[in-house]
Interface confidence: medium
C-alpha cells in the first residue's frame, strides 16, 4: 500500500531511508536538458523475494537536444549533485534497515539524473531526519517518521526534531556555556549559548538600506 | 489600507546567518505575535497561518539584512514590528528597536 | 497550533514582594519556553530559556521553573525596575507563540 503523503517536512532539515521496502517506487527523473528515453522506464520498482530484493527497471536520460540513446554510467562521485535523499552527514543512524529482509539499497546513480529523488513510499517505510549542513539538532525524542495505516488511511508519524541556526562552530564574545542540561536538549550538547552585546539590529521601514517607506498600491 | 510595507532589519557584530531571525508584531496595547522566521543561511522563510500569502520574508547575507514585507495593509496591521535573533531553544535573545507602522486612510 | 495562556492577567505588588506569574500550554512543550520582559515603548527582553536557564545579566531574583505543560516564572523580591509586563513563549514547535501577557503593576 503506498503512502499517500510525502513524509513530514521539518524546517532546515532533510530525511534519508536507510533502505526501501519492496512495493517503493523511484521516479525515473532527469536534470534540466535531459529526457527518459523513448520507452524508457518511467520508475524503477523494489521487488523482491523472501532472501533478495533490488530494483527492477532501469532509468536511462538523453539530451532533450538529441535523439540518440545515451548509454548508461554511473557518474564519479565528484560528479554526483546533492539529492535531498542522500545530504545526510553522519553514516551513524540508529537501524541499518538495509540488512532487514524485504528492503532494497539506495539504487546506483544514473546518468543525467535529476539532483532530487522522488520516491513514493509504502506503509511500513521508515526515513530518518538530520538537519542540513550549518544547523543543529535539538532532539525532543525519535528523528524518524514511520509511514502507519490506521483506519484505512495512511499517515506518517511525526519527527521529533527541530533545526536551530546556531552553528557548533560560531564563536562570538561574551559567549558562556548553558546553566543547564534540561530534558528536550540532548546530553551530547557542546555548542554553547551565545549572549553578547555586540550583536545589534536596528529596524526600518525601508526599501533599501535608507530610511524611507517603501509601499505598493494594492492591486 | 491595500498597500504594502517592507521593513528592513540590520544585524551587526554577529554571525548573521547563522542565525534564524523572527518576526514578531505587536498592535496598541496588545500582546506579542510572531509573524514568521528565516534562517538567512538557508534562505528559506516560515510564516505563521494568519499571515501566510500576505507576508513575505526574505535575508540579504551580503548586508546582514533581513526583510519583512506585508501586503494588502489594513488598518489592524498597524502595530510595532520587531525583528529578534531567535535561537530556537535559547529564545530571541537580541531584538530590533521595532518599527511602528500605521495603516490609516 | 500551541496556545500559550498566561495568568493572572495583571497583577499589583509591592517592592519586596514575592510574585509568581503561571503560563499553561495547550499540549506539552518540553522543555522549549521562555520568559521575557517589556517596558512601554521597549522592545522585549529575554530573560528566562529552556524553562529555567537564566540570560546572562539578568538578576538572579528571577527565576522559572515547570515542564510539559505548566510553567511558572518567579520574581523573589520585587524590584522598581522590575514594574513591566512578562510573556511567555513556546518553541517547541511552530508557529511560535506568546502567552498573552502579565503585567505586574505597582500596588
Known amino acids: 500500500e503506498l503512502c499517500d503523503d510525502d513524509p513530514p517536512e521539518i524546517p532546515h532539515a532533510t530525511f534519508k531511508a536507510m533502505a526501501y521496502k519492496e512495493g517503493t517506487m523511484l521516479n525515473c527523473e532527469c536534470k534540466r536538458g535531459f529526457r527518459r528515453i523513448k520507452s524508457g522506464s518511467l520508475y524503477m520498482l523494489c521487488t523482491g523475494n523472501s532472501s533478495h530484493s533490488s530494483w527492477d527497471n532501469q532509468c536511462q536520460c538523453t539530451s532533450s537536444a538529441t535523439r540518440n540513446t545515451t548509454k548508461q554510467v554511473t557518474p564519479q562521485p565528484e560528479e554526483q549533485k546533492e539529492r535531498k535523499t542522500t545530504e545526510m552527514q553522519s553514516p551513524m543512524q540508529p537501524v541499518d534497515q538495509a540488512s532487514l529482509p524485504g528492503h532494497c539499497r539506495e539504487p546506483p546513480p544514473w546518468e543525467n539524473e535529476a539532483t532530487e529523488r522522488i520516491y513514493h513510499f509504502v506503509v511500513g517505510q521508515m526515513v530518518y531526519y538530520q538537519c542540513v549542513q550549518g544547523y543543529r539538532a535539538l532532539h525532543r525524542g525519535p528523528a524518524e517518521s514511520v509511514c502507519k495505516m490506521t483506519h484505512g488511511k495512511t499517515r506518517w508519524t511525526q519527527p521529533q526534531l527541530i533545526c536551530t541556526g546556531e552553528m557548533e562552530t560560531s564563536q562570538f564574545p561574551g559567549e558562556e556555556k548553558p546553566q543547564a542540561s534540561p530534558e528536550g536538549r540532548p546530553e551530547s550538547e557542546t555548542s554553547c549559548l551565545v549572549t553578547t552585546t555586540d550583536f545589534q539590529i536596528q529596524t526600518e521601514m525601508a526599501a533599501t538600506m535608507e530610511t524611507s517607506i517603501f509601499t505598493t498600491e494594492y492591486q | 489600507p491595500g498597500s504594502s510595507v517592507k521593513v528592513s532589519c540590520k544585524a551587526s557584530g554577529g554571525t548573521f546567518s547563522s542565525y534564524a531571525i523572527s518576526w514578531v508584531r505587536q498592535a496598541p496595547g496588545q500582546g506579542l505575535e510572531w509573524m514568521g522566521g528565516?534562517?538567512?543561511?538557508?534562505?528559506?522563510?516560515n510564516y505563521a497561518q494568519k499571515f501566510q500569502g500576505r507576508v513575505t520574508i526574505t535575508a540579504d547575507k551580503s548586508t546582514s539584512t533581513a526583510y519583512m514585507e506585508l501586503s494588502s495593509l489594513r488598518s489592524e496591521d498597524t502595530a510595532v514590528y520587531y525583528c529578534?535573533?531567535?535561537?530556537?531553544?535559547?529564545?530571541?535573545?537580541?531584538w530590533g528597536q521595532g518599527t511602528t507602522v500605521t495603516v490609516s486612510s | 497550533d500551541i496556545q500559550m495562556t498566561q495568568s493572572p492577567s495583571s497583577v499589583s505588588a509591592s517592592v519586596g514582594d514575592r510574585v509568581t506569574i503561571t503560563c499553561r500550554a495547550s499540549?506539552?512543550?518540553?522543555?522549549?519556553l521562555a520568559w521575557y520582559q517589556q517596558k512601554p515603548g521597549k522592545a522585549p527582553k529575554l530573560l528566562i530559556y529552556a524553562v529555567s536557564s537564566l540570560q546572562s545579566g539578568v538578576p538572579s531574583r528571577f527565576s522559572g521553573s515547570g515542564s510539559g505543560t505548566d510553567f511558572t516564572l518567579t520574581i523573589s523580591s520585587l524590584q522598581p525596575e522590575d514594574f513591566a509586563t512578562y510573556y511567555c513563549q513556546q518553541s517547541y514547535s511552530l508557529p511560535l507563540t506568546f502567552g498573552g501577557g502579565t503585567e505586574v503593576l505597582i500596588k
Open positions: 528565516i534562517i538567512p543561511i538557508f534562505g528559506t522563510a
Open positions: 499540549q506539552g512543550i518540553s522543555s522549549w
Open positions: 529578534a535573533r531567535d535561537k530556537g531553544y535559547y529564545g530571541m535573545d537580541v
